[in-house]
């Protein structure tokens, strides 16, 4: 495997991770795929300090993060444990609201204008943040 020792061009380094902040919107799955094709993942917030860093960079704009409950329980895209981990939901959230009229509930989490989290319809075209860790060996699958 290969190790990433510095952040790619246009990415921001912070606490041994690299972050990329979009300035346009995509549905959650499309944003997730963009990050994955860049060997990254939608941002996983593990501390109040990281929350404040991301919030500073995105401003008061709805922005996807790597947290969803599309398969039942809430899960972080990198496997970080949700139950024991950092959370910053708005009061009364997540609520899996069905009243939006778009079909289904709300299965994807985003930063709201004040930085706190809300669950929303995954198809909404919000901005997003990619994250990749430095010094993490990237596992190349064996060739067939």
């Amino acid at each position: 495997g290969s190790e990433r020792t510095c952040c790619p061009v246009n990415w921001v380094e912070h606490e041994r991770s690299c972050y990329w902040f979009s300035r346009s919107g995509k549905a959650w799955a499309d944003a997730d795929n963009y990050c994955r094709l860049e060997d990254a993942h939608l941002v996983v917030v593990t501390s109040w300090e990281e929350q404040k860093f991301v919030q500073h960079h995105i401003g008061p704009v709805n922005t996807w993060m790597g947290l969803h409950d599309q398969n039942g329980p809430w899960k972080w895209v990198d496997g970080t444990d949700y139950e024991t981990g950092f959370k910053n939901w708005r009061p009364e959230q997540p609520d899996d609201w069905y009243g939006h009229g778009l079909g289904g509930g709300e299965d994807c989490a985003h930063f709201t204008d004040d930085g706190r989290w809300n669950d929303d319809v995954c198809q909404r075209p919000y901005r997003w943040v990619c994250e990749t860790e430095l010094d993490k060996a990237s596992q190349e699958p064996p060739l067939l």
Partner: antibody
Framework: EVQLLESGGDLIQPGGSLRLSCAAS????????MSWVRQAPGKGLEWVSA????????FYADSVKGRFTISRDNSKNTLYLQMNSLRAEDTAVYYC??????????????WGQGTLVTVSS | DIQMTQSPSSVSASVGDRVTITCRAS??????IAWYQQKPGKAPKLLIY???SLQSGVPSRFSGSGSGTDFTLTISSLQPEDFATYYC?????????FGPGTKVDVK
């Protein structure tokens, strides 16, 4: 100068297997997402598959999912496409293409010259 | 999947003409679109990305515009080397999809 050179195209019977290769040079291969795009004779372009720079994330068109496997060897600057259970409709020129990420999306900024795969009995 | 349609399917033009090709997406794709030029027996070449950004080395007579579902490629003054087939491609979401192409040939 970026160069992509495909090889491995051949005449193959339906149900057979083939592996295409793409030798890359002129850029940092291990940092670049790569893709395969095909073009049936006299037809338009069809995206087939893509892979991240490390090889850890792969994506496929529904038409090839479960039959084709994209992979790469960054030590050899080479991209591969393993094609199994080939069908007549897989007959096409297969292009290797480099992907560039620009402000939130990916585009094919360099292409190889293509290699012809013909599936026929 | 997002379907891309192009019009016209072919256009006959002369050197110096202004040529406009349109592309429509089956759903909104913001500005996540590219335009490629392909000549017979050759690989495609990237001309425009992000709907309106000119790829390095591409002549300024090529321009792109549009957002959402409707996009345009314009060649302001057709040159002999511009006779080719032009494809639009969306990269908003997987699977990436191309339009069927527009052939620009000699009138």
């Amino acid at each position: 100068e970026v160069q992509l050179l495909e090889s491995g195209g051949d005449l193959i019977q339906p149900g057979g297997s083939l592996r295409l290769s793409c030798a890359a040079s002129g850029f940092t291969f291990s940092s670049s997402a790569m893709s395969w795009v095909r073009q049936a004779p006299g037809k338009g372009l069809e995206w087939v598959s893509a892979i991240s720079g490390s090889g850890g994330n792969t994506f496929y068109a529904d038409s090839v999912k479960g039959r084709f496997t994209i992979s790469r060897d960054n030590s050899k600057n080479t991209l591969y496409l393993q094609m199994n259970s080939l069908r007549a409709e897989d007959t096409a020129v297969y292009y290797c293409a480099k992907l560039i990420a620009v402000v939130g999306s990916h585009y094919f900024d360099y292409w190889g010259q293509g290699t012809l795969v013909t599936v026929s009995s | 999947d997002i379907q891309m349609t192009q019009s016209p399917s072919s256009v006959s033009a002369s050197v110096g003409d202004r040529v406009t090709i349109t592309c429509r997406a089956s759903q909104g794709i913001s500005s996540w679109i590219a335009w490629y030029q392909q000549k017979p027996g050759k690989a495609p070449k990237l001309l425009i990305y992000g709907a309106s950004s000119l790829q390095s080395g591409v002549p300024s007579r090529f321009s792109g515009s549009g957002s959402g579902t409707d996009f345009t490629l314009t060649i302001s003054s057709l040159q002999p080397e511009d006779f080719a087939t032009y494809y639009c491609q969306q990269s908003n979401s997987f699977p990436f999809t191309f339009g069927p192409g527009t052939k620009v040939d000699v009138k």
